[in-house]
Interface confidence: low
């Protein structure tokens, strides 16, 4: 059961540089969670969503043909993917194949809190889940070709909840 596992919160800062705007817009994403099998480490990079596939937006990253446009001057980048249609492991592994340093998966149910993802065997790539609202917020900038930088840092270790009777 997800609630009975310990998990680590992720402290996420997002910086958006809109054209024509002097100072960048920065905001914090609360309630992010590291995946169970993710390294609990800090990472920074430019956020990228997959390229369209067959004329349709690809938010899920489940298709074997999923591709990312990685600018040649970018050393570290973070994949933004929506939850659903395939396992967390598949999504994370596909982004890792394209040399992402981290994957941020946003939920696919607006009222639901992030879960602690399980994705054994994905190696060194950092994996975090955020709410659907925040994920779509970031995606809206990417769809306008606006550069988005993200820093993910380790927050608090949350111990497993004790479900014993009488507590």
């Amino acid at each position: 059961d997800n609630a009975s596992q310990e998990y680590y919160t992720a402290l996420i800062n997002v910086t958006v540089q809109e054209p024509g705007r002097g100072a960048p817009l920065t905001f914090r994403i609360d309630r992010g969670r590291y995946g169970l099998d993710s390294p609990k480490a800090e990472v920074r990079g430019q956020v990228l969503a997959p390229l369209p596939l067959h004329g349709v937006a690809d938010h899920l990253g489940c298709d074997p043909q999923t591709r990312f446009f990685v600018p040649p001057n970018i050393k570290q980048w973070i994949a933004l993917l929506q939850r659903g249609n395939c396992t967390f492991k598949e999504k994370i592994s596909r982004a890792a194949f394209h040399n992402a340093v981290a994957v941020v998966i946003y939920n696919n149910k607006s009222k639901e809190e992030p879960v602690t993802m399980t994705h054994p065997g994905t190696g060194d790539i950092i994996a975090v889940m955020i709410t659907e609202l925040r994920g779509k917020d970031i995606l809206s900038y990417l769809e306008k070709n606006i550069s988005v930088q993200m820093t993910i840092a380790v927050g608090t270790r949350m111990p497993p909840k004790n479900f014993s009777r009488g507590s």
């Epitope: 390229l51 369209p52 596939l53 067959h54 004329g55 591709r67 990312f68 446009f69 990685v70 040649p72 394209h98 040399n99 070709n145």
Partner: nanobody
């Protein structure tokens, strides 16, 4: 196999403009990145600009504000509008098509010479 044909190079005075074109033919899968690189005499080939299918654009710092990359997906063609040219822009300009995310460009054009005189 993909063929790339560049055109539009030539001799221009400093401060002038040129527009390069690159048409891709052959087997073109749906979504790919097109870009321009250049190689000056005695130097390594360097990135100039690139554009994704969805028109996300990226530029080398040395050409930002002077060069504009665009593309016509229907014609499988990419353009490089070069304004305020400088002598240091002199080079052979190569078009490239990338079908993957890591800039291992599989296909290159033959190149077009751009010479900027002072």
């Amino acid at each position: 196999q993909v063929q790339l044909q560049e055109s539009g190079g030539g001799l221009v005075q400093a401060g002038g403009s040129l527009r390069l074109s690159c048409a891709a033919s052959g087997y073109i899968s749906g979504y790919y990145v097109m870009g321009w690189y250049r190689q000056a005499p005695g130097k390594e080939r360097e990135f100039v600009a690139s554009i994704s299918y969805g028109a996300s654009t990226y530029y080398a710092d040395s050409v930002k504000g002077r060069f504009t990359i665009s593309r016509d997906n229907a014609k499988n063609t990419v353009y490089l509008q070069m304004n305020s040219l400088k002598p240091e822009d002199t080079a052979v300009y190569y078009c490239a098509v990338d079908f993957d995310s890591n800039y291992a460009h599989t296909y290159w054009g033959q190149g077009t010479q751009v010479t900027v005189s002072s």
